[in-house]
């Protein structure tokens, strides 16, 4: 038994981290194969993680963490029984991938102007709550082509559109997700998405 | 919010011990190391050692070895540090702060005197 | 017996800009990160900077932390009375299984 892609992992630099492989062949990861990881730093403690099948050979581990900051190191070692198959290290603030947000919410109801918040997917003590931008992507479910994305650049969790930049009498679905630019993050996954139907006043014509 | 709430000021005599508490509330006790330092009338601050709540263990500064105790009361979710053999230099303000490489939550402190 | 060297004091008028150096060695800031603390007169110590140059949630951006090499700096610009204070770096000695260690402790006045 041998490890063929070695494991790569991003962390939610909140609680989880997220280790992918790959075997050689075909393996039942959660009976076969163990994932040892542990902070360097005084008292810590080492914590075992059981793998999941992520396709015929593909492993996948989820990997709980308390209170992650950027001086974190993990010594990351793989067994299968008494079989050290890989050793390596993860330091979870270089390989990080936000939390997608949440609650994404339009409302119509502001004169002929769209208001779209959601909420940060961080709690305030968290080192990132502060350092997300979003992307917020909105397209029409009648109109493949009428497809958008706003790049919201400022720390507040909320879009202001003016209705009429969409077409009246149809629905729009948005969604949005995260990064950090100081943490130089990927994209977190997409928020789900929320449909509204958008309508406005027309102006009159002279 | 977060919170760490001290126990009151303390005089004690050389030779004696102390038990200072730190009572933390708005977080996931379990979940983040505890510090304990110090800091003398006019003077800098001054590491004491650490104390990993989840296990209980514990690691001290060379300085204080043999002579502090830190424990942890998940139930209550406080810690505390115990200082014995009190001399007069052990006069401070003791402080327990919430972290691991850096504190961003800070008790308010706790003074002991030692005086005869 | 504080390993970091920070100036005992230092000072300025309101509006201007001030730092405050830390110095070390490799086995603390040079292989290390650096965090700075504030502590007003006869209150705790408050975290400024963390990460060498990172500020908590609520930390003005008128207080700015650099490393480079064995030695760190903290600055502060646009100068207010409030600001006077003692002033602490932080980091953690890697000979020690990382235990923590501070500066020795700056006064900042303000003219």
């Known amino acids: 038994m041998k490890v063929l892609q070695e494991p790569t992992c991003v962390s939610d630099y909140m609680s989880i981290s997220t280790c992918e492989w790959k075997m050689n062949g075909p393996t039942n990861c959660s009976t076969e194969l163990r994932l040892l990881y542990q902070l360097v730093f005084l008292l810590s403690e080492a914590h075992t993680c059981i793998p999941e099948n992520n396709g015929g050979a593909g492993c996948v581990c989820h990997l709980l963490m308390d209170d992650v900051v950027s001086a974190d190191n993990y010594t990351l070692d793989l067994w299968a029984g008494q079989q050290l198959l890989w050793k390596g290290s993860f330091k979870p603030s270089e390989h990080v991938k936000p939390r997608a947000p949440g609650n994404l919410t339009v409302h119509t109801n502001v004169s002929d102007t769209l208001l779209l918040t959601w909420s940060n997917p961080y709690p305030p003590d968290n080192y990132l709550y502060n350092h997300l931008t979003y992307a917020v992507n909105i397209w029409s479910e009648n109109d493949p082509a009428d497809f958008r994305i706003y790049n919201v650049t400022y720390l507040e969790p909320s879009l202001r559109i003016a209705a009429s930049t969409l077409k009246s009498g149809i629905s729009y679905r948005a969604r949005v997700r995260a990064w950090a630019q100081c943490y130089n993050t990927t994209w977190s996954e997409w928020s789900p998405s929320t449909k509204w139907h958008n309508s406005y006043r027309e102006p009159f014509e002279q | 919010q977060v919170q760490l709430v001290q126990s009151g000021a303390e005089v004690k005599k050389p030779g004696a011990s102390v038990k200072v508490s730190c009572k933390a509330s708005g977080y996931a006790f379990t979940s983040y190391y505890m510090h304990w330092a110090r800091q003398a009338p006019g003077q800098g601050l001054e590491w004491m050692g650490i104390?990993?709540?989840?296990?209980?263990?514990?690691s001290y500064a060379q300085k204080f070895q043999g002579r502090v105790t830190m424990t942890r009361d998940t139930s209550t979710s406080t810690v505390y540090m115990e200082l014995s053999s009190l001399r007069s230099e052990d006069t401070a303000v003791y402080y327990c702060a919430r972290g691991k490489w850096w504190w961003q939550y800070w008790g308010k402190g706790t003074l002991v005197t030692v005086s005869s | 017996q504080s390993v970091l060297t920070q100036p005992p004091s230092v000072s300025a008028a309101p509006g201007q800009k001030v730092t405050i150096s830390c110095s070390g060695g490799?086995?603390?800031?040079?292989?290390?990160?650096v965090s700075w603390y504030q502590q007003l007169p006869g209150t705790a110590p408050k975290l400024l900077i963390y990460d060498n140059n990172k500020r908590p949630s609520g930390i003005p951006d008128r207080f700015s932390g650099s490393k480079s090499g064995t030695s760190a700096t903290l600055a502060i610009t646009g100068l207010q009375t409030g600001d006077e204070a003692d002033y602490y770096c932080g980091t953690w000695d890697t000979s020690t299984t990382y235990h923590p260690i501070f500066g020795t402790g700056t006064k900042l006045t303000v003219l």
């Open positions: 490799s086995s603390n800031i040079g292989n290390s990160y």
């Open positions: 104390i990993n709540p989840s296990g209980g263990s514990t």
